[in-house]
């Protein structure tokens, strides 16, 4: 006899990176017939939703109108059908950005390089932080961590045309509180004809997540479709 229901999916709309004082929606998708969903934050109950009518709804949305550092952290959700509870969802890392200062991003030897050259990004922030994050724009939006007192270096090694793109960095005050984003740095990698094919995209990201984050920062726009699958949170772990 089944003792628990399958775990729900959890994600943030429009993005898991939320500028301070902007809004975010946390979505939890379980099963039709679920009479109650619970959202947990850092191990404590955060919010409850009882969909009506439960048999016609398999997803609930929890609205956070005013993001701040107290709400940044790890979220999970569960749901109940009758008296039977589900397994908890995967963890959603909700990050507050635009905290305190803006780092400076630079690239060595320069923004225009030849395929095979070694490239290093430097992210500098003079305020008290020791962790830095480098993000490449686009659908993959991979996060790299770096450490240093006021500056971190991100060696990309010998680059290929797959490294082309626009990069930004953040200073991180803890895992879930990040600075303003740096100004973008566009890396241009030239190579032979056979190497200039399009870089493969990570299939787990269904949209240009960075563009969505920028929309959030500029307008606080809410979008009603899932831009980040829960697997995106693995980037932070």
């Amino acid at each position: 006899q089944q003792q628990t229901l399958p775990k729900p999916f959890i994600w943030a709309e429009p993005h898991f990176m939320v500028p301070k004082e902007k809004q975010v929606t946390i979505c939890c998708q379980g099963n039709y017939g679920a009479v109650e969903y619970q959202l947990h934050f850092e191990g404590s109950l955060f919010a409850v939703d009882r969909p009506k009518p439960p048999e016609r709804i398999n997803k609930v949305k929890f609205y956070i109108p005013d993001m701040n550092s107290r709400m940044a952290g790890q979220y999970s959700c569960i749901y109940r059908v009758g008296e039977l509870w589900s397994e908890p969802s995967n963890l959603l890392d909700l990050v507050v950005t635009e905290m305190y200062d803006t780092p400076t991003l630079s690239v060595h030897p320069g923004p225009e390089v030849i395929s095979g050259e070694k490239v290093t990004f430097y992210c500098r922030l003079d305020t008290a932080t020791s962790m830095f994050l480098l993000l490449k724009e686009g659908r993959s939006s991979h996060v790299q961590r770096g450490y240093g007192k006021v500056q971190a270096e991100f060696p990309l090694g010998p680059v290929t045309t797959a490294h082309r793109g626009t990069y930004r960095c953040f200073g991180s005050y803890n895992n879930h509180a990040w600075s303003f984003p740096s100004e973008p740095v566009k890396l241009l990698v030239t190579g032979d004809i056979e190497n200039t094919s399009l870089a493969p995209e990570d299939p787990t990201f269904p949209a240009d997540t960075w563009g969505t984050y920028l929309l959030t920062t500029e307008t606080g726009l809410q979008k009603d479709h899932a831009l980040w699958d829960h697997t995106a949170q693995n980037l932070l772990r």
Partner: nanobody, 126 residues
Framework: EVQLVESGGGEVQPGGSLRLSCAAS????????MGWFRQAPGKEREFVAA???????YYAESVKGRFTISRDNAKNTVYLQMSSLRAEDTAVYYC????????????????????WGQGTLVTVKP
């Protein structure tokens, strides 16, 4: 901007009842989820009860069956009816709001609330 003003606190004997009120200013009350929290001397603020825009409610285990939260959108007011009061219910009671929110959302964690009242003191003693 939402302003919340609590009233109805006072001194009561164990087993007695009180009704707290929280009046909200502004036209956003109908789009707000509301909650009551309390803080006893030397203790952390704790959740008491909450109500969604659609009148769904949730209670702390310690008050379930004794306290009732309700709202009157016409009067922009949320209430906390407290009965069978005990000495351990002595605290400053705070009203809080999440504005705006979805219809069925009930918020339990204090971090979720973006507006707070100044509090009203409830003392339960013989």
């Amino acid at each position: 901007e939402v302003q919340l003003v609590e009233s109805g606190g006072g001194e009561v004997q164990p087993g007695g009842s009180l009704r707290l009120s929280c009046a909200a200013s502004g036209r956003t009350f109908a789009s707000a989820a509301m909650g009551w929290f309390r803080q006893a001397p030397g203790k952390e603020r704790e959740f008491v009860a909450a109500i969604s825009r659609s009148d769904d409610t949730y209670y702390a285990e310690s008050v379930k069956g004794r306290f009732t939260i309700s709202r009157d959108n016409a009067k922009n007011t949320v209430y906390l009816q407290m009965s069978s009061l005990r000495a351990e219910d002595t605290a400053v009671y705070y009203c809080a709001a999440v504005v705006p929110t979805y219809g069925n959302n009930i918020y339990v964690h204090s971090a979720a609330y973006n507006y707070w009242g100044q509090g009203t003191l409830v003392t339960v003693k013989p």
